[in-house]
């Protein structure tokens, strides 16, 4: 197994609808054909898995049906979108990339993207 560099933005602000998108780019040393991408959330020194997908190069990323993540791939870039975020979900989201095939196995872990989520203010009642 070998190490690999993974780049991702330092900070992303989620939309008012609780959607955050960022690009995860990995420095593939060769022509990988099977890639696994995992998003991890680190908060208070606890690391939890948010979502994961294995994809064959050239195909779409397929997350589980109940996943809060969607994504597309283009070359060595993965465009990730996380939905349904609330203020309590603010934290560091780490992109992990594994090159599963062909050998050797490579693992790359990004430095993380700090995603800030601000719950929208409720609309004030308006009198007409």
């Amino acid at each position: 197994c070998k190490a690999m560099h993974v780049a991702q933005p330092a900070v992303v602000l989620a939309s008012s609808r609780g959607i955050a998108s960022f690009v995860c780019e990995y420095a593939s040393p060769g022509k990988a054909t099977e890639v696994r991408v995992t998003v991890l959330r680190q908060a208070d020194s606890q690391v939890t898995e948010v979502c994961a997908a294995t994809y064959m190069m050239g195909n779409e990323l397929t997350f589980l049906d109940d996943s809060i993540c969607t994504g597309t791939s283009s070359g060595n870039q993965v465009n990730l979108t996380i939905q349904g975020l609330r203020a309590m979900d603010t934290g560091l989201y780490i992109c992990k990339v594994e090159l599963m095939y062909p050998p050797p196995y490579y693992l790359g872990i990004g430095n993380g993207t700090q995603i800030y989520v601000i719950d929208p203010e409720p609309c004030p009642d308006s009198d007409f």
Epitope: C1, T38, L40, E49, T54, K96, M100, Y101
Partner: nanobody
Framework: EVQLVESGGGLVQPGGSLRLSCTAS????????MGWYRQAPGKQRELVAD???????NYADSVKGRFSISRDGAKNTVDLQMNSLRPEDTAVYYC?????????????WGQGTQVTVSS
Amino acid sequence: EVQLVESGGGLVQPGGSLRLSCTASGNIFSRYIMGWYRQAPGKQRELVADITPGGNTNYADSVKGRFSISRDGAKNTVDLQMNSLRPEDTAVYYCNALGSDKLLIRTYWGQGTQVTVSS
């Protein structure tokens, strides 16, 4: 806790066949590369074959065309079908799982099963 348990080893004559099976416990099977390695007396452990979660396979040159690896996600098993066995295939065969757990690379090994090819 992850455990890999092998079965199916034994004594077989040259030209014969054996099927090794490895059962994985723990939540790793769908995420890890599963493989078989072997170690003959006085030699280093070497890769025989492995299979990715997506079903891509990789074989050592010495077993290509004779051995076949497969995985069953429903049963959490990985099998190695060994045909046209030769005396030089004699070794202890180990099941292996390679992948990552959160931020760490992990590799797990079974206890091994003896395969002896002799007349």
